[in-house]
């Protein structure tokens, strides 16, 4: 992507309070594959409503259904996964919510309540009956698929039964499961049955087996665990913000940019400009001016007004938001017609968005 | 996954100028600000600066905007702290961290006659 | 620059004991803080992010809170690999100032 010659600074400056970005971590919905997710706009009064996902307007499709202010998702795949935003349009202003969606082989966080009644998971059998491993308990088992943040204990239980008693072991993605394999270790409770890893973390994920056995038969289940990573993440802007314009010469126009962050961001307003009659400096890179950015003297940075324009202002509106994790940007185009030409809005063009990973 | 491999211990002369190096793995090398921390023998955690490597944007900590140069060259995905006119008083461990959650694992900078 | 001050500078406590270290900064940081645990020879980790958000990888012992110049860095039941030097950090604007640290010592 391209690099700028900056007529002014562009590098992270002392930014405004944080009056207008919705810094609090979204809400996460979770979904394993092939299933469907229906979500409802958490917003009020909503004469319009559009969506977006990671920025990039979202419009339906074989597999998604918009349908007033819910979303259904059909069939989820973990592409689907990412910060998804409703924006509600109204007669006098518009407002965003964000949330995301994590689809993964993963459903729900761990159980890890304590074995408190673990005693009755394990069932002595008449010496008599002689009997392969069955399953005790197959309501304990039926969450196969464990989302859980990072840090937190898992614990993955296959209560059985059988004569003799049988005897459990672990794999992890096929492969037996040694202490070493992961720091810490882990804790096996061959009274509960369970297995116990605490503080988990990303190379935690993978497939627990456990493979329950006796001299008559072996019997096995396997959980899926995902471990969902917390870290601040760089800004992200509305897709379609800010959108082309056009205006005569002497009128006014705005351009806006929506930003979620959650970190405190500042914003930037840049312009392609010429110096000394020349838009590129002696390196071949283009001019750029700051003409508004966010900090203690800007009011809403995320709107710039330009007043009576002229059409040495028509050109391209680059909006660029940072945080001390990243970067994003995008642009408008404003078009000055003469006086005699009708302005008119122009088609709205999303700009090509800053993709998170 | 995410790793910050520093290059390695240097002793310099007051007045030289040093050069560390942080090479950055396991993301997406151009998303993400390399800040640069400092720690001298007994003192605190001091911000030098950060590169967006993206676009080549810097911003330096005023104390060291005349003696410090970033630089990132995204075909290696490594991001260089240039730190001229050393004095014995940079003397420190220094950090190149990306957005502060990952750090490599610090380079020992002596400057000694 | 906005300086951070972090109290106390040192602080002795027994495992199992509940731990508070406060930050203050000179001016309001609208919740743009970072916490981070440094030992010796080792490089600083991420903690908490955004005054009250835990980190990849942090046990939820550890907790943060605060607003506007008053920050908390809480660790509800020490356990013996937590005693290390803290940092908080100001991460609102450029410097982004850390305070001088609070050392956590065993008693």
């Known amino acids: 992507r391209p690099s700028f010659s900056l007529v002014e600074d562009t590098t992270l400056e002392p930014e405004e309070p944080p009056t207008k970005y919705q810094i609090s971590q979204p809400e996460v919905y979770v979904a394993a594959p092939g299933e469907s997710l229906e979500v409802r706009c958490l917003l009020k009064d909503a004469a319009v409503i559009s969506w977006t996902k990671d920025g990039v307007h979202l419009g339906p499709n074989n597999r998604t259904v918009l349908i007033g202010e819910y979303l259904q998702i059909k069939g989820a795949t973990p592409r689907d996964s990412g910060l998804y935003a409703c924006t509600a349009s109204r007669t006098v202003d518009s407002e965003t919510w964000y949330f995301m969606v994590n689809v993964t082989d993963a459903i729900s966080s761990g159980d890890d309540e304590d074995d408190t009644d673990g005693a009755e998971d394990f069932v002595s059998e008449n010496s008599n009956n002689k009997r392969a491993p069955y399953w005790t308990n197959t309501e304990k088992m039926e969450k196969r698929l464990h989302a859980v943040p990072a840090a937190n204990t898992v614990k993955f239980r296959c209560p059985a039964g059988g004569n003799p008693m049988p005897t459990m072991r672990w794999l992890k993605n096929g492969k037996e499961f040694k202490q070493e394999h992961r720091i810490g270790g882990y804790k096996v409770r061959n009274q509960h049955w369970s297995l116990i890893m605490e503080s988990v973390v990303p190379s935690d994920k993978g497939n627990y087996t456990c493979v329950v056995e006796n001299e008559y038969g072996s019997i096995n289940h396997t959980y899926h665990l995902d471990v969902v990573e917390r870290s601040p993440h760089r800004p992200i802007l509305q897709a379609g913000l800010p959108a082309n314009a056009s205006t005569v010469v002497g009128g006014d126009v705005e351009f806006v940019c929506k930003v979620y962050s959650d970190a405190q961001p500042h914003i930037q307003w840049i312009k392609h400009v010429e110096k000394n009659g020349s838009k590129y400096g002696p390196d071949g890179l283009p001019y750029l001016k700051v003409l508004k950015h966010s900090g203690i003297n800007s009011s809403n940075a995320e709107v710039l007004a330009l007043f009576n324009v002229t059409e040495a202002d028509a050109g391209e509106y680059i909006c660029k938001v940072s945080n001390y994790i990243g970067q994003a940007n995008q642009s408008a185009w404003l078009t000055v017609l003469p006086k005699q030409q009708a302005p008119g809005r122009e088609k709205e063009i999303t700009a090509s968005p800053d993709y998170l990973e | 996954q995410v790793q910050l491999v520093q290059s390695g211990a240097e002793v310099k002369k007051p007045g030289a100028s040093v050069k560390v190096s942080c090479k950055a793995s396991?993301?997406?090398?151009?998303?993400?600000?390399i800040h640069w921390v400092r720690q001298a023998p007994g003192q605190g955690l001091e911000w030098m600066g950060a590169?967006?490597?993206?676009?080549?944007?810097?911003s330096y900590n005023q104390r060291f905007k005349v003696r410090a140069t970033l630089t990132a060259d995204t075909s290696t995905s490594t991001v260089y702290m240039e730190l001229s006119s050393l004095r014995s008083e940079d003397t420190a461990v220094y950090y190149c961290a990306r957005a502060f959650t990952y750090w490599g694992q610090g380079t020992t900078v002596t400057v000694s006659s | 620059d906005i300086q951070m001050t972090q109290s106390p500078s040192s602080l002795s406590a027994s495992v199992g004991d509940r731990v508070t270290i406060t930050c203050g900064a000179s001016?309001?940081?609208?919740?743009?803080l970072n916490w981070y645990q440094r030992k010796p020879g080792k490089a600083p980790k991420l903690l908490i992010y955004g005054a009250t958000n835990l980190a990849d990888g942090v046990p939820s012992r550890f907790s943060g809170s605060g607003s506007g110049t008053d920050y908390t860095l809480t660790i509800s039941s020490l356990q013996p690999e937590d005693f290390a030097t803290y940092y908080c950090?100001?991460?609102?604007?450029?410097?982004?100032?850390f305070g001088g640290g609070t050392k956590l010592e065993i008693k």
């Open positions: 001016e309001n940081i609208y919740g743009a």
């Open positions: 590169i967006y490597p993206d676009n080549g944007d810097t």
């Open positions: 950090q100001n991460v609102l604007s450029t410097p982004y100032t």
């Open positions: 396991g993301y997406i090398f151009t998303n993400y600000y």
